[in-house]
Interface confidence: medium
């Protein structure tokens, strides 16, 4: 069960794995989520009743029962990891912490004009995990405007203390904002001869690379394949660093592969490993053994069991019961197998809990003005929202984002007095399919953003809470919300869909239309709409020459973009000047800017 709320003045008793320092309970929750074993945490906020040496401690905890006894304690804030949740998570943290000194190894100090410049410097420095910046009000003259870049073994501060007139923050590499080089190549027959900071077992170089990417100190790696001559080193993934940030020596060695951390790449790197490895046995601590039908079900079982990190599915005759094989659910201290054996009659793989690989990331069938007709199941998150007053008609589009939630535009509800007159139809391709007896979802509640006034001024976003839950099928399933860490991703495969007009004076289309539309920068968009303010909470899309666009009736529907093989709800059709006009792009609500609002509303008790 996903619990995102933080429990104030509450401490979880026992189950301690380790203690780190974080500037907030929110960040403690993120650290817990990325830790291989952490399920719960207790954070201590600054408080006169607490010993200052305990301020900002974040105690990561584990429990076989997935919960721990709660004890009342002032200044303690507790909560659960996001591993239990299905929404996409990100390590991206743009917060700036005022009057906090986050301590670490200060390896670089320089003058910066602002905290933002200091943060940019940290983001563009290969070793930097976080920074402290002394503002121009700082009492020490020599320290004023000084930007201290810091790193630690864990990527989190070694201590956090109160210090007036300084600010601290984290590198934004995990927000895909770094300008450092991103080297994606994996080099065969190569060993990087630099100091090892850690080593783990991995089934292939790609997994090794992803582990390196999410390890705070790893800058590059060397992986010894299963054919490596030294048996004891086979499948060993060496995580490496160097002072310069680059390998000092490359040695040609057969059956070894080397590569670089992708921490600086301008896209999100999955934390999880989805591939299944046939003929491989992953060793680790036994969590559970169950009989299931097929390796995919075994992986699903592991993903659902929150403490499971990896699994082996055995088809040995003695491990079979009817048509089911034995599914060994396992874990280890670092989330990686303790040994990897080949030539077995089994298949192994990892839990998908940190892919946040859920209904929204499931592969969709392969594959609007100037658009073309869609096929059934192509856009399974697209819904048609009907009003029954005065007569029944298509009102707006919308997107399934959860089993009880539709995301749409606020401007759709102008003049809508009550949710009772609304009907949500999902899994629809043609409007003509909707008859008197067609099943629909009633709307329990309309939640409009409280800052919404009109579409053109932004905040054009609304949630519909359905009266009943959606059972996911191939034709009706959710779309992923964009991750905050992907704010700077450049989406290149974006589509707008809807039953709206095909030209300005037209009628609602029978068949769901689709059009591929390129995103336009906000600067470019602002030039096209001089009379309006295009804010960062809006996103624009359209061809310079026009011809393809959303139009009346498409409002509230999705601007869907495919990234890393997953569809994301990047925009909500909001407004524009005419339809498909030359140099008048469509303006959409920039969903990534509202992820916190969405989560707050959909997860409120």
């Amino acid at each position: 069960e996903c619990v995102t709320q933080l429990l104030k003045d509450t401490c979880f008793e026992g189950g301690d794995i380790t203690t780190v320092f974080t500037p907030s309970a929110k960040y403690c929750q993120v650290v817990c989520t990325y830790h291989p074993r952490c399920l719960l945490f207790t954070f201590t906020a600054e408080s006169p009743s607490e010993d200052p040496t305990r301020w900002f401690t974040c105690v990561l905890k584990d429990s076989v029962t997935e919960t721990l006894p709660r004890v009342n304690r002032t200044a303690a804030i507790s909560g659960y990891s996001f591993k239990q949740c299905s929404h996409q998570i990100s390590a991206c943290n743009k917060d700036i912490y005022v009057d906090l000194d986050m301590k670490g190894i200060n390896y670089n100090s320089s003058v910066a004009k602002s905290a933002q410049e200091c943060q940019e410097r940290c983001t563009d420095d290969v070793h930097c995990h976080f920074f402290t910046y002394a503002t121009r009000q700082f009492p020490s003259l020599e320290h004023r405007n000084i930007c201290l870049l810091k790193h630690t073994q864990t990527g989190t501060p070694t201590r956090i203390t109160k210090l007036d007139k300084v600010v601290s923050g984290f590198s934004l590499k995990s927000c895909a904002l770094s300008n450092l080089a991103c080297i994606r190549d994996i080099f065969p027959n190569t060993v990087f001869a630099d100091s090892n900071i850690d080593s783990v077992m991995a089934p292939d170089a790609f997994v090794c690379g992803r582990i390196c990417t999410h390890h705070p100190g790893c800058l590059f790696f060397t992986f010894f394949s299963q054919e490596w001559p030294k048996e004891s080193q086979r499948n060993l993934c060496l995580l490496k660093t160097s002072e310069s940030g680059l390998p000092s020596t490359r040695i040609k060695k057969s059956k070894a592969l080397s590569g670089f951390s992708l921490q600086s790449c301008r896209h999100s790197i999955p934390v999880c490993h989805s591939k299944i490895y046939p003929g491989v046995d992953f060793g680790g601590e036994e969590l559970n053994v169950t009989f299931v039908k097929g390796v995919n079900v075994c992986q699903e079982t592991c993903t659902k069991m929150i403490r499971c990190q990896f699994f082996t599915y055995s088809l040995l005759p003695e491990d079979c019961k009817e048509e089911k094989g034995k599914c060994f659910l396992r874990l280890s201290m670092d989330g990686s197998p303790t040994r990897i054996a080949y030539g077995t009659q089994g298949s192994s793989g990892y839990s998908l809990r940190l892919c946040m690989d859920n209904e929204c990331t499931t592969k969709i069938k392969p594959r609007i003005v100037g658009g073309t007709a869609s096929v059934r199941g192509e856009w399974p998150w697209q819904v048609t929202l009907h009003t029954t007053s005065p007569t029944q008609r298509h009102l707006c589009g919308g997107s399934i984002i959860g089993n009880q939630w539709i995301l749409t535009a606020a401007h759709c509800f102008y003049g809508v007095e009550s949710p009772k007159i609304l009907r949500v139809y999902s899994g629809i391709l043609n409007q003509s399919e909707i008859k008197e007896d067609t099943s629909f979802f009633g709307v329990q509640e309309i939640i409009i953003h409280d800052q919404y006034k009109m579409a053109e001024s932004g905040y054009d976003i609304a949630l519909l809470k359905l009266e009943t839950t959606v059972n996911y099928t191939d034709s009706q399933r959710p779309i992923c919300l964009p991750s905050k860490g992907d704010r700077n991703v450049i989406y290149t495969d974006c589509w707008v869909t809807g039953w709206g007009y095909r030209k300005l004076r037209d009628k609602i289309q029978n068949t769901l239309q689709k059009a591929k539309i390129p995103l336009v920068t906000n600067e470019e968009c602002q030039k096209r709409y001089r009379g309006h303010k295009i804010t960062h909470k809006m996103i624009c899309a359209g061809y310079r020459e026009g011809g393809k666009d959303a139009c009346k009736g498409d409002s509230g529907g999705p601007l869907s973009c495919k990234h890393n093989e997953v569809w994301h709800l990047v925009g909500i059709t909001s407004w524009g000047e005419g339809c498909a006009q030359r140099e008048r792009p469509g303006v959409y609500t920039n969903v990534v800017e509202y992820v916190d609002w969405i989560l707050e509303k959909t997860q409120a008790v």
Epitope: N106, V111, S140, L141, I146
Partner: antibody, heavy 121, light 108 residues
């Protein structure tokens, strides 16, 4: 390695002037704040002046020397200077030039060997 | 200006002794305190920075502690080369940088 060598000290009469120099080597001189610190015979350390690296207008002085001493630097020659005017008997001291490093907090991490200034009639 | 007061002004100790020197600031200086060692006829040498961090190359028998207004420098086992004068210095509210008056450590 880092080296700071002071010169220009000597005996001078009250009211007269003297210019001290400090030659720096072994580090990127222009990137660092530089100080003058003095020590009267048998006494403790007294900070005199600082020249900040990042702002040419940022020169600061101890109250005891304000208006009489001027700190300056020539980054092209890796040199630090202290122009001392209207000297008084109480200015008699060993004058050290020191490099400042920000190791979490500002520190005087390298010092020259010092040059003695004696103000006497 | 922030005043720094060291105590004692001088002390006698023997090789192998554990020695503690204290430094008090007239107002809170967080951990913006450094310690220096000066031998006769020589320039001062940085020992400890930020109240408790050991400068590279300084023996581990030297340690510093404290925060706010009260600080200590400890030499765990006195060696012959440790007989010198020790100064504390604040760099929290500057200018001016201010030093303590010094503590002279001599052989008993």
């Amino acid at each position: 390695q880092v080296q700071l060598v002071e010169s220009g000290g000597g005996v001078v009469q009250p009211g007269r002037s003297l210019r001290l120099s400090c030659a720096a080597s072994g580090f990127t001189f222009s990137s660092y704040n530089m100080h003058w610190v003095r020590q009267a015979p048998g006494k403790g350390l007294e900070w005199v002046a600082i020249f900040l690296s990042y702002d040419g207008s940022n020169k600061y002085y101890a109250d005891s020397v304000k208006g009489r001493f001027t700190i300056s630097r020539d980054n092209s020659r890796d040199m630090l200077y202290l122009q001392m005017n209207s000297l008084r008997a109480e200015d008699t001291a060993v004058y050290y030039c020191a490099k400042s490093e920000i190791l979490v907090v500002p520190t005087l991490d390298y010092w020259g060997q010092g040059t003695l200034v004696t103000v006497s009639s | 200006d922030i005043q720094m007061t060291q105590s004692p002004s001088s002390l006698s100790a023997s090789v192998g002794d554990r020695v503690t020197i204290t430094c008090r600031a007239s107002q809170s200086i967080s951990s913006y305190l450094n310690w220096y060692q000066q031998k006769p006829g020589k320039a001062p040498k940085l020992l400890i920075y930020a109240a408790s961090s050991l400068q590279s190359g300084v023996p581990s028998r030297f340690s510093g502690s404290g925060s706010g207004t009260d600080f200590t420098l400890t030499i765990s086992s006195l060696q012959p080369e440790d007989f010198a004068t020790y100064y504390c210095q604040q760099s929290y509210s500057t200018p001016p940088i201010t030093f303590g008056q010094g503590t002279r450590l001599e052989i008993k």
